[in-house]
């Protein structure tokens, strides 16, 4: 029961996390104009991974996509790649984990197969979460670096002096959404991996005992075998009675759980 709960909770947490990663990737507020110590302006800039937006004081908002690949910073491209990889891995992980859920029966799928699928999806969620956290962290680092580098440079022109200032940008809402979502996906993945351990079936060896009657008076006695889990002290099946009976271990070196008397 605890295994099912852990697996189910891991799935739900990962689902929320991946939905968050998708939301963060699509959001426009990855970086927002830093208004602290800025002269009053009539526009507010904010940017995402895919487009740049401006909100005027009148309330009018306009966005324009980055219709180029070569003109974009390499770091931005790297962040895009990390987020997409995270989403793809997460989506595949979700698909695998649906079939791995203990509460869902699909044909005659064995517990060992479900355990393997649970582990696979768990690893996928972990990698997905790490990709999202890495992507958001790389972007945050880029913002911090730009923030301190955005100092005024003076260019002397023919008609006088022109001051070029790069507007300072700070963390947008998407970064926090991405960090939290990545963390949730990571936690969900860990939970799935923990659930996998509980799903793996215990090896039960049914060691059958064959009876060879030494005389005509000795009849076959049913129930002449014991099941052993292999974890107890009774790893060898004892003889039920004397009179030609010997354990299957003495006859067959590789007992199978399908060997019945």
């Amino acid at each position: 029961m605890a295994v099912t709960a852990c697996q189910g909770l891991g799935f739900v947490v990962s689902l929320i996390g991946i939905a968050g990663i998708i939301a963060a990737t699509c959001m426009d507020q990855w970086s927002t104009q830093d208004l602290y110590n800025n002269p009053v302006t009539a526009v507010f800039n904010y940017q995402g991974l895919w487009r740049s937006c401006v909100r005027e004081s009148s309330g009018f908002t306009e966005c324009r996509g980055y219709f180029t690949l070569l003109g974009l910073p390499a770091m931005l491209q790297a962040v895009r790649a990390l987020m997409i990889v995270g989403i793809v891995l997460g989506a595949i992980g979700l698909l695998v984990s649906i079939f791995a859920l203990k509460c869902i029966r699909i044909g005659s799928m064995e517990d060992s197969a479900k355990a393997n699928m649970t582990l696979t999806s768990g690893i996928m969620f972990i990698v997905s979460g790490l990709c999202a956290i890495a992507g958001v962290s790389v972007f945050a680092n880029m913002l911090v670096t730009n923030f301190w580098m955005s100092t005024a440079n003076m260019y002397t022109g023919m008609g006088g002096m022109v001051q070029t200032v790069q507007t300072r940008y700070t963390f947008g809402a998407a970064l926090f959404v991405g960090w939290v979502a990545g963390g949730l996906t990571l936690i969900g993945g860990v939970m799935m991996c923990i659930a996998c351990r509980g799903l793996a079936p215990e090896e039960t060896n049914y060691k059958a005992v064959s009876y060879h009657a030494s005389g005509h008076s000795v009849a076959y006695k049913p129930g002449g075998f014991k099941a052993s889990t292999g974890f107890g002290s009774n790893t060898k099946n004892k003889k039920i009675y004397d009179g030609g009976a010997r354990t299957e271990d003495e006859v067959q070196s590789y007992p199978s759980k399908h060997d019945y008397v």
């Epitope: 009539a42 800039n45 740049s52 401006v54 980055y66 974009l72 070029t164 790069q166 507007t167």
Partner: nanobody, 122 residues
Framework: QVQLVESGGGVVQPGGSLRLSCAAS????????TNWYRQAPGKGREFVAF????????TYADSVKDRFTISRDNSKNTLYLQMNSLRAEDTAVYYC???????????????WGQGTLVTVSS
């Protein structure tokens, strides 16, 4: 090379008018929002007016509303500020500034001119 050159400043009597111009070069003016700022002697820089890259969305500081008009001509790469009913408190150095509207995945650039002095005195 980026240049923003203001002109049209001077001495004017209270109630008079002036038209400031700002000629831009060295960048794609038509993709930049533009502003006028001013700095009175011994005071901080103050926002005066804004106009977006298409020539719409004009916004003004309360102190200049209904007296000043901002406009631009993208074909001439020039920004204008028509100042009417000037008062003594309008005395300041006026700066034009261009703000990149849609930067490509990096912080937008702001370009500032060197300023032109407007003195309102009788």
């Amino acid at each position: 090379q980026v240049q923003l050159v203001e002109s049209g400043g001077g001495v004017v009597q209270p109630g008079g008018s002036l038209r400031l111009s700002c000629a831009a070069s060295g960048f794609t003016f038509s993709t930049y929002d533009t502003n006028w700022y001013r700095q009175a002697p011994g005071k901080g820089r103050e926002f005066v007016a804004f106009i977006n890259y298409r020539g719409g969305g004009a916004t003004y500081a309360d102190s200049v509303k209904d007296r000043f008009t901002i406009s631009r001509d993208n074909s001439k790469n020039t920004l204008y500020l028509q100042m009417n009913s000037l008062r003594a408190e309008d005395t300041a150095v006026y700066y034009c500034a261009a703000h990149e509207r849609f930067p490509m995945g990096r912080p937008p650039y702001d370009y500032w001119g060197q300023g032109t002095l407007v003195t309102v005195s009788s």
